[in-house]
Interface confidence: low
């Protein structure tokens, strides 16, 4: 039956381990409850509770049943798509490795211009290589209904997540309710702004309280936050209570009903609940499901503010009209005025095209690319001219009256607020991104991405710095591989070694500290893992009644 | 590379005021915090406060009252004013930088620090 | 104010020997703490932040333990240059606050 009908029997292993998933799930809350239902020796009348737990262990039996179940359907092992995948994938590493041994012994015989064309071919070929594994890689993420898992559990933890939230803003009682108040007012740019109030708003839910947004006379809209987003909470918007004070930590807190935020560089002393770590109880399904799990939580917070009022939705709906936004495309963020010479260094738009043509022909090996389409956000109102001269093949989408406002003397008014709204949609909307991470808008960009599709984790490419987010606790790898200098620049590594990333150069090097040693300098970006940060956030089960 | 140096009158009578100077190279008073210490001769240290990145001020709650710090960016100096000086405030004064590596991780680099005595 | 209390004023060791310096927070600091290591004369130089994680340059026979109360740094394959006096720091809330000095 397996080798009549592959298809039909790799959907049905992937339901089965679908299902096997969702019960191991249902099994870890039943025993979640079950324990805090358990009840004490002695005989005590507990009424309908004592009931109520044998029920919860009588279904706890059933489960554990049904998984030893699923768990013998299941050992037949993969599905024939994903080992005809896998077994490619090895291939292709072992003919990348032939084909470079090669041709990296014949570059050593050759000089002048015969060794240029030489190259030139070579690193044209090596890109073929590379996209031909990627592909397979793509496939491989998707076959045996990897793909279909993706989705579901991807949009399942987006809604618990998304429950939870609305749940800790929309407190039953107001008055009784604890508070955190967040003033928008931080003297920098809108993506600046926005990452502060997602920044109040992780050490709200991290301390159970709802967040209360502050933004009357709001530099970029005077009406404040509500006149462009819809309102934080619905029913509670009103910061009064019997006590206030200044965040002086959460024990310390805790008899505060309405604690004052300062901007996260003057926080102390600072709570766990902070980039880049994510809640313990989602980290294990995270991590499956999402290639950077911190940018997702951070995600979670950025949708749920920025949900627009309805006459910003039509704005959005009437832009991607006009400009002809379409599919394939993707998204250049060019950050040039007041950044340049202070944070970020100058990058002429050859840069960034690099990537965009290298992206377009992965692109091209799975799907028809009709056009190679590009939105082009800037704050630089003569790049598009430049762009469209010197790339005539590519279809250039950009509204330049949004670079004329994002410039520094217009800045801060309400019109600049719709275009740099319009440009983090848009870019966020796009296939790829390539940008400097330096840059708020492209990292906002970047994490509302990661709210449309179960893993966008790998859909970008930053000329500068990798993601980050500002006042972040530390950025930590685990070395997996044991690392000899070969250079003054390189510091040693041991596997399980701690190393405090700095930077990707994106070159094969990375920059950081070996915790270990207290040394910095480069190693090799392969030979080390993500460290992924678990804090013990509060779980709200009361929003899932 | 990352130096700080401070400049005291050396001398002060008691109850006067005392302004000392850190003048900072090697980094950036946006970036970084700045925090005060003493040392009286033979004993231990004093934290006084410190001026964040952003401007914001934080202060022992024991010498809030006759404690300012302040600075000024563009010229890389960063101030300390204490007033109604008495002679148990003679110390060493130091100045150090608030080290940020995710966490706050105290402080990484001081000044060689400038001696006061408080005496008529 | 949170009280770091070094319990040992002086301690005599031998070249090459290994020594521990102990600081007791008088309540949970987390892993807030820092080390200094100061000589006749000179500022304090920075040895240990986040309880066991070492500046950059500190040679890696400092080493610093512990969270919550105790904490200790231990100088292993001690030196003659080590011969100085040692502080620990919390800065879990304010005031920051340092040990006596041992």
């Known amino acids: 039956r397996d080798n009549d009908h592959p298809d039909h029997s790799s959907r049905e292993l992937s339901k089965i381990l679908a299902k096997l998933e969702r019960l191991k799930q249902q099994n870890e809350d039943l025993r979640r409850m079950a324990e805090s239902l358990r009840i004490p020796e002695g005989p005590i009348d507990q009424g309908p509770a004592i009931g109520r737990v044998r029920v919860l262990e009588e279904q706890l039996v059933k489960a554990k049943e049904q998984i030893e179940n699923y768990k013998k359907q299941t050992r037949n092992g993969l599905g024939k798509d994903h080992e005809i995948l896998r077994r490619r994938i090895e291939n292709g590493a072992k003919e990348l490795w032939f084909f470079l041994q090669s041709e990296l012994k014949k570059l050593k015989n050759l000089e002048g211009n015969e060794l240029q064309r030489h190259a030139d071919e070579f690193l044209l070929d090596l890109g073929h290589h590379e996209r031909s594994i990627m592909t397979d890689l793509y496939y491989l993420s998707q076959t045996d209904g990897a793909g279909d898992w993706r989705e579901k559990e991807a949009k399942d933890l987006t809604e618990l997540v998304q429950r939870r939230i609305t749940y800790l803003q929309n407190p039953k009682d107001c008055s009784k309710a604890k508070k955190l108040v967040c003033n928008i007012n931080k003297g920098c740019g809108y993506g600046c702004q926005l990452h502060h109030v997602v920044y109040c708003f992780m050490i709200a839910y991290g301390t159970q309280r709802t967040l209360i947004l502050e933004s009357q006379n709001w530099r970029y809209a005077t009406g404040g936050w509500e006149t462009v987003f819809r309102p934080v909470s619905e029913t509670c918007t009103d910061r009064s209570g019997i006590s206030t004070g200044h965040w002086s930590g959460e024990v310390k807190d805790k008899n505060v009903q309405v604690v004052e935020l300062p901007i996260v560089d003057s926080l102390h002393p600072r709570p766990p609940y902070l980039p880049l770590a994510v809640p313990e109880d989602l980290a294990d399904r995270l991590v499956r499901v999402h290639g950077d799990p911190a940018v997702w939580w951070v995600s979670q917070f950025v949708k749920y503010l920025i949900r627009p009022q309805p006459w910003l939705e039509k704005e959005i709906e009437e832009a991607t009209k006009k400009l002809g936004f379409k599919h394939p495309v993707i998204g250049v963020h060019v950050r040039r005025t007041d950044k340049v010479g202070t944070e970020a260094a100058f990058h002429p738009i050859e840069e960034y095209m690099v990537h965009v043509e290298e992206h377009f022909q992965l692109l091209a090996r799975r799907m028809q690319v009709d056009k190679k389409r590009v939105y082009l956000a800037t704050d630089d109102p003569s790049l598009l001219k430049e762009a469209k001269t010197k790339y005539p093949n590519y279809e250039f989408i950009s509204d330049n009256s949004i670079s004329w406002s994002a410039g520094l003397h217009n800045r801060y008014t309400e019109n600049s607020l719709r275009g740099v709204i319009l440009d983090i949609h848009f870019l966020s909307q796009a296939d790829f991104l390539v940008c400097t991470f330096s840059s708020q808008v492209c990292r906002v960009a970047y994490e509302i991405m990661q709210t449309l599709h179960p893993d966008a984790s790998a859909n970008f490419h930053s000329l500068d710095d990798i993601y980050y987010f500002g006042g972040q606790n530390a950025h930590n790898q685990i070395a997996i591989y044991a690392h000899q200098p070969r250079t003054a620049d390189e510091i040693p590594m041991e596997p399980g070694d701690i190393i405090g990333v700095a930077g990707n150069h994106w070159d094969g090097y990375s920059k950081g500290v070996n915790r270990k040693l207290g040394r910095t300098g480069l190693y090799p970006s392969y030979k080390v893992r993500e460290k992924i940060e678990t804090v013990k956030y509060p779980t709200y089960p009361e929003a899932e009644k | 590379q990352v130096q700080l140096k401070e400049s005291g009158p050396g001398l002060v009578a008691p109850s006067q005021s005392l302004s000392i100077t850190c003048t900072v190279s090697?980094?950036?008073?946006?970036?970084?915090?700045v925090n005060w210490v003493r040392q009286p001769p033979g004993k231990g240290l004093e934290w006084l406060g410190m001026?964040?990145?952003?401007?914001?001020?934080d202060y022992n709650s024991a010498l809030k009252s006759r404690l300012s710090i302040s600075k000024d960016n563009s010229k890389s100096q960063v101030f300390l004013k204490m007033n109604s000086l008495q002679t148990d405030d003679t110390a060493s004064y130091y100045c150090?930088?608030?080290?940020?590596?995710?966490?706050?991780?105290?402080?990484?680099?001081w000044g060689q620090g400038t001696s006061v005595t408080v005496s008529s | 104010d949170i009280v770091m209390t070094q319990s040992q004023k002086f301690m005599s060791t031998s070249l090459g020997d290994r020594v521990s310096v102990t600081c007791k927070a008088s309540?949970?600091?987390?892993?807030?703490v820092a080390w200094y290591q100061q000589k006749p004369g000179q500022s304090p130089k920075a040895l240990i932040y986040?309880?066991?994680y070492r500046y950059s340059g500190v040679p890696d026979r400092f080493a610093g333990s512990g969270s919550g109360t105790d904490f200790t740094l231990t100088i292993s394959n001690v030196q003659s240059e080590d011969l100085a006096e040692y502080f620990c720091?919390?800065?879990?809330?304010?005031?920051?606050?340092f040990g006596g000095g041992t």
């Open positions: 150090a930088r608030d080290f940020y590596d995710g966490y706050l991780y105290a402080m990484d680099y």
């Open positions: 090697g980094f950036s008073l946006t970036g970084y915090g």
């Open positions: 001026i964040w990145g952003d401007g914001s001020t």
């Open positions: 309540q949970n600091v987390g892993s807030y």
């Open positions: 986040s309880a066991s």
């Open positions: 720091q919390q800065y879990y809330t304010y005031p920051y606050t």
